[in-house]
Amino acid sequence: AVNGTSRFTCFYNSRANISCVWSQDGALQDTSCQVHAWPDRRRWNQTCELLPVSQASWACNLILGTPDSQKLTAVDIVTLRVMCREGVRWRMMAIQDFKPFENLRLMAPISLQVVHVETHRCNISWKISQASHYFERHLEFEARTLSPGHTWEEAPLMTLKQKQEWICLETLTPDTQYEFQVRVKPLQGEFTTWSPWSQPLAFRTKPAALGKD
């Protein structure tokens, strides 16, 4: 960053999107700012306009191509700059040499569905979205189940240490409403972080069979 009160953080979704957030104390909300991407070994440059997301932070997505196109590799370095307009001039507010596969955050898993539900268990599957083929099977997942009377923050995390796009939830209560979420993370990358949580999937366990007299 150009000065100590500025923070510029970007993540690559592994395909064709770099999402950036820039925070700057004392910056004006109505200032026009751009993130400028300059790859070291590609023939394209890309910009996106930073839009305010809070009092002192701005965000935008560098869309590098169609969602599933592989626009960068592990050897790419992209110079990312925050440029803000000051009158008729543009001033560089922050800069970083961005290594995309060291700063990964995938898209949230999608297409969650109940494969099979019983009284005490439920089998759920999902799909990963816009994830690079470079990862092969080197992904891990975290999942959580929301039980009645609890919050998401209280839900214990279940870890899947392999590329497994399903889970069998057990020891559930019959005839009870639950919600389920999952997130994904590549094993690669020093600054890689978890994807956002998926949209919650609501499901209900089957009622217990009535006992015979």
Epitope: S32, Q34, H36, W44, N45, Q46, T47, C48, E49, L51, C60, I63, L64, G65, T66, M83, W90
Partner: nanobody, 123 residues
């Protein structure tokens, strides 16, 4: 590669209005800063207006400020130029331009271009 098709040009009297449209296909529209340029007979192509990927920020050549409005509809992959209070000196072929780099949009050789639409303003 992105393709641009302009429409909406025509003959109008001084003081009248026209709305130009530029339909974009072949790539992700929101990647692009979009601009309008114009070229009058015997003159060089000149920048008229631009709009950022989000549509939040616009820029105009001084001679059209207050009369022209550039906008975009990211759902329809279209950029517009609303031209009011037209003057005879606005007569030109109007071109739509696209560039993934905001800082290159005024550079003639860096842009992708449409085929142009003729605007004629009679006095």
């Amino acid at each position: 590669q992105v393709q641009l098709v302009e429409s909406g040009g025509g003959l109008v009297q001084a003081g009248g209005s026209l709305r130009l449209s530029c339909a974009v296909s072949g790539d992700v529209f929101v990647r692009y800063t979009m601009a309008w340029f114009r070229q009058a007979p015997g003159k060089e192509r000149e920048f008229v207006a631009s709009v950022t990927d989000s549509g939040r920020t616009t820029d105009y050549v001084h001679s059209v400020k207050g009369r022209f409005t550039v906008s975009r509809d990211n759902a329809k992959n279209t950029v517009y130029l609303q031209m009011n209070n037209l003057k005879p000196e606005d007569t030109a072929v109007y071109y739509c331009a696209a560039n993934t780099d905001y800082f290159q949009i005024k550079s003639l050789d860096a842009n992708t271009w449409g085929q142009g639409t003729q605007v004629t303003v009679s006095s």
